[in-house]
Each structure stands twice: as structure tokens, then as C-alpha cells.
Interface confidence: medium
């Protein structure tokens, strides 16, 4: 069954290559395990950036992913992707799966276009 | 059934002849044994470079291969090939098989072109 996932349409990464955005879903039935996956869409190709499972006790996610972090509260996940460079500019989709207990629900946001601008290199000091 | 395997299109080996790249797959259904094979394509010939089976308990792979190493996390394998020389420049494909339990899924990435530049020999010191 499907759930509605919302995320901002555009986010500009900081000069340090960090982009943060919320991913919210509804309806939020009582769920013990929520799996959140961040996917990047390039052309017709979808690649997984990072994924994690949140629980009532485990509200900090993506511990195994150096470039992703996230916190979970009720039906909202605050996502942060770091280490971004200009080549990483693209559409990032948030997928939410209400894993357990049944029934299983899944939903995908329309995507957040993340723009990344590489900083100019510092001039050599004389 | 097929799964989608993604890997970067180009990677430049370090001056020490080491190339690292991720190999990711989706969808990732609950799988206890994931077999990852690295193949090199030269002309129409495909040769196996190394292969390993990852499990939930065994997340470090290619222990029998001196030139390959890899770590496995959820649906991502971080591959490292070392000992590369300029003659090893070529297209390296990542093949993923979700081995067990059934149903079996298999997928092959489009390949990562690894460029290897042999280092310039250091000038003799006088």
C-alpha cells in the first residue's frame, strides 16, 4: 500500500558540500520499524545513496554511511548529505517504508534537486 | 529475476595502483548470502578478477584474492583492487547475485572504466 512522502523541491548545498532537507510521510500508522532510503536519479537510472532503519529506540540513522546522517521524529526524517561536490548535483529522492508491524506501506517523494557548487581553491600564500 | 546494479562509470587508480569504487544494488530484499564478482571486459572477453560471498556475519570479502578487497553493508559493496599497472586499464564490471534464500536475483553493473597511470620513476639522487 502507498503512503504520501513529501520533501522540498530544491535545496542548495553549503560551501562545505552539506545539504539538509526534511522528508515527511503520512498517514503515520503505529510503526515499530521505518526504513528510509535516499536514492539519486540520473537519467532513467536510480542509485541508492544510503539507507537506514529507524525504530522508536533508534532515532539516529545512517551510522554506516559516512556521507549521510538523519534523525527521526514521529513521521518526519531530517536528512543530511555531506561530502557533496559539483558532480553530485542532481535529484535525490526519499523513499519511506513502514516495515513492521504489518501492513507494509511504501512511498516515494518527488525528489529534492540538490545543487552543489564547488568552492574556488584558495590562492597560495606568499 | 534481475536487480539493478550501479557502479561509477570512471575511476582513476592512485599512483600506487589502487582503485576503489562502490557497487550498489537494488531492490535489496532480505538476503543472507550475497555473491559479488568483479569481471574485466577486454574486447568481447570477460574474465573473472575476483569473487566472494558476503553474509550478515561475513562482511569482509575476497580473503583468497591478494589483489581484491571489499566490505559489504546492506546493499552496498565497497570494492578495492590493488596492484594495478597501466596495462590493467580497462572496464571492470560488478556482478551481484542475491543467492539465498530464494528467489535468486542477479544483476550486472555497466562497468567502471579504471584508468591506471604508471608513476614516473623518481630521479636518481646525486
Amino acid at each position: 500500500e502507498a503512503i504520501q512522502v513529501t520533501q522540498p523541491s530544491v535545496v542548495l548545498a553549503s560551501s562545505h558540500g552539506v545539504a539538509s532537507f526534511p522528508c515527511e510521510y503520512s498517514p503515520s500508522h503505529n510503526t515499530d520499524e521505518v526504513r528510509v532510503t535516499v536514492l539519486r536519479q540520473t537519467n532513467d537510472q536510480m542509485t541508492e545513496v544510503c539507507a537506514t532503519t529507524f525504530t522508536e529506540k533508534n532515532t539516529v540513522g545512517f551510522l554506516d554511511y559516512p556521507f549521510c546522517s538523519g534523525t527521526f521524529n514521529e513521521s518526519r526524517v531530517n536528512l543530511t548529505i555531506q561530502g557533496l561536490r559539483a558532480v553530485d548535483t542532481g535529484l535525490y529522492l526519499c523513499k519511506v517504508e513502514l516495515m513492521y508491524p504489518p501492513p507494509y506501506f511504501v512511498g516515494m517523494g518527488n525528489g529534492t534537486q540538490i545543487y552543489v557548487i564547488d568552492p574556488e581553491p584558495c590562492p597560495d600564500s606568499d | 529475476e534481475a536487480i539493478q546494479v550501479t557502479q561509477p562509470s570512471v575511476v582513476l587508480a592512485s599512483s600506487h595502483g589502487v582503485a576503489s569504487f562502490p557497487c550498489e544494488y537494488s531492490p535489496s530484499h532480505n538476503t543472507d548470502e550475497v555473491r559479488v564478482t568483479v569481471l574485466r571486459q577486454t574486447n568481447d572477453q570477460m574474465t573473472e578478477v575476483c569473487a566472494t560471498t558476503f553474509t550478515e556475519k561475513n562482511t569482509v570479502g575476497f580473503l583468497d584474492y591478494p589483489f581484491c578487497s571489499g566490505t559489504f553493508n546492506e546493499s552496498r559493496v565497497n570494492l578495492t583492487i590493488q596492484g594495478l599497472r597501466a596495462v590493467d586499464t580497462g572496464l571492470y564490471l560488478c556482478k551481484v547475485e542475491l543467492m539465498y534464500p530464494p528467489p535468486y536475483f542477479v544483476g550486472m553493473g555497466n562497468g567502471t572504466q579504471i584508468y591506471v597511470i604508471d608513476p614516473e620513476p623518481c630521479p636518481d639522487s646525486d
Epitope: - | 529475476e1 543472507d32 560471498t53 561475513n58 543467492m99 534464500p101 530464494p102 528467489p103
Partner: antibody, heavy 124, light 107 residues
Framework: EVQLVESGGGLVQPGGSLRLSCAAS????????MHWVRQAPGKGLEWVSA????????YYADSVKGRFTISRDNSKNTLYLQMNSLRAEDTAVYYC?????????????????WGQGTLVTVSS | DIQMTQSPSSLSASVGDRVTITCQAS??????LNWYQQKPGKAPKLLIY???NLETGVPSRFSGSGSGTDFTFTISSLQPEDIATYYC?????????FGQGTKVEIK
């Protein structure tokens, strides 16, 4: 000749323990998923447990979960089933079976080689 | 868990008869179904795998068909050595489950 030979069955009191073994020969044991299937006297077949090639994945029927442990020693070509807290309803012939995976792009699995079975009787 | 329901539970037929056994799954299992033969006092033997594929060395009078939830096992011409109990088994998901069995006897 491809063969599976079970051993370790016998009479045990309720609450007791037993360890079944299954010795494999004639094939590369480590290349196969292995299963235990049981059959109570005069009844049908009941799948009990499975273990993947290296032991990374183990599976159990709800009726034995938490009481039975499947394991394997590939160096000895042997499959094991450690049975604890045995109950009268565990009385059965226990078969070990080889799981053959078939198909190219989609696996199926079938028990293509079976042992002769070993009888476990749980009774006071 | 997926329940497998076999029918009939027993049947009696004459040598040369066509014998049909059905197996119904409680949910769609695609073609993830096997058929086994078990003779008295013996271990089961694989006859049909993946719903319709004949195991090597098994006589061609045995066949299987079906997909989804409804499956059929057929012996085209019953022979005296076919006296046995036949079981279907799903491998769509764990726990793996068998049908309750069909006992085939000769009239």
C-alpha cells in the same frame, strides 16, 4: 555415490536434549544449502530448519524456534541439529536433505538428496 | 505461513489409470512448487521441481503443471511401483511447507 547418513537419534525424556548429525559424502558439501525435515509417526512431512553454505543464514520452523539450533562443519562434511527442551510432539523421524538450487536467472530450491532418517522418541 | 492443501487425501486406482492430485496454496507462490514421492519406510524422493520440471531419472509418466495458487500432479498410467504417498511443497517463502500428502493405492 551421493549420500547423506543421519545419526544421533534415540529415546530422550521430555525437556532433554539430543544432537543429530548428518554425514555427507559423494558431493561438495559446502556448495549446498542443507535442511532438516521431520515426519511424526503416521503423519506427513514437516520442514524443520535450513542453513546456507557457510552457515551465514539459518532458518527455523516456528514450532522449533528457540529450542533447536542448526549448524554445519564444512571441513567435516557434516550437518548438525542441536535439539533442546524436547517435547513429546518432537517425536519423529528426522531426515537431513540437500537443497539443490536450480535455474539461471531465478533460483528455485528442491530437496534432491535425502538421508535414510533417524528416529527421535521423546517420552517419559 | 503459506498453507498447502492437497486433495484427495487418498485414492485408489487401477493399473494403467490416469491419476491426478491437486495442491492449492493459500497465497500466490508463482511456480515455486515441488512434488515428492514417499514409499513406506523410505525417505522421500524428488519427482517434479519448479511446478513442471521432471527430475532426472524420473519416468515420464509423472508430470506437473500449474502456477499461482493451483497446481496439479499427474501419473499418466499408474504402475504397481507407484504405490506411495505424494507430497507437494512450496519454496516461495520461509517457513517451507508441505501438503498433507495423498496416499495412492492400487485397486
Amino acid at each position: 555415490e551421493v549420500q547423506l547418513v543421519e545419526s544421533g537419534g534415540g529415546l530422550v525424556q521430555p525437556g532433554g536434549s539430543l544432537r543429530l548429525s548428518c554425514a555427507a559424502s559423494g558431493f561438495t558439501f559446502s556448495s549446498y544449502v542443507m535442511h532438516w525435515v521431520r515426519q511424526a509417526p503416521g503423519k506427513g512431512l514437516e520442514w524443520v530448519s535450513a542453513i546456507t553454505w557457510s552457515g551465514g543464514g539459518t532458518y527455523y520452523a516456528d514450532s522449533v524456534k528457540g529450542r533447536f539450533t542448526i549448524s554445519r562443519d564444512n571441513s567435516k562434511n557434516t550437518l548438525y541439529l542441536q535439539m533442546n527442551s524436547l517435547r513429546a510432539e518432537d517425536t519423529a523421524v528426522y531426515y537431513c536433505a540437500r537443497g539443490r538450487l536450480f535455474g539461471l536467472v531465478r533460483y528455485g530450491e528442491a530437496f534432491d538428496v535425502w538421508g535414510q532418517g533417524t528416529l527421535v522418541t521423546v517420552s517419559s | 505461513d503459506i498453507q498447502m492443501t492437497q486433495s484427495p487425501s487418498s485414492l485408489s486406482a487401477s493399473v494403467g489409470d490416469r491419476v491426478t492430485i491437486t495442491c492449492q496454496a493459500s497465497k500466490d507462490i508463482s511456480n515455486y512448487l515441488n512434488w515428492y514421492q514417499q514409499k513406506p519406510g523410505k525417505a522421500p524422493k524428488l519427482l517434479i521441481y519448479d511446478a513442471s520440471n521432471l527430475e532426472t531419472g524420473v519416468p515420464s509418466r509423472f508430470s506437473g503443471s500449474g502456477s499461482g495458487t493451483d497446481f496439479t500432479f499427474t501419473i499418466s498410467s499408474l504402475q504397481p511401483e507407484d504405490i506411495a504417498t505424494y507430497y507437494c511443497q512450496q519454496f516461495n517463502s520461509f517457513p517451507l511447507t508441505f501438503g498433507q500428502g495423498t496416499k495412492v493405492e492400487i485397486k
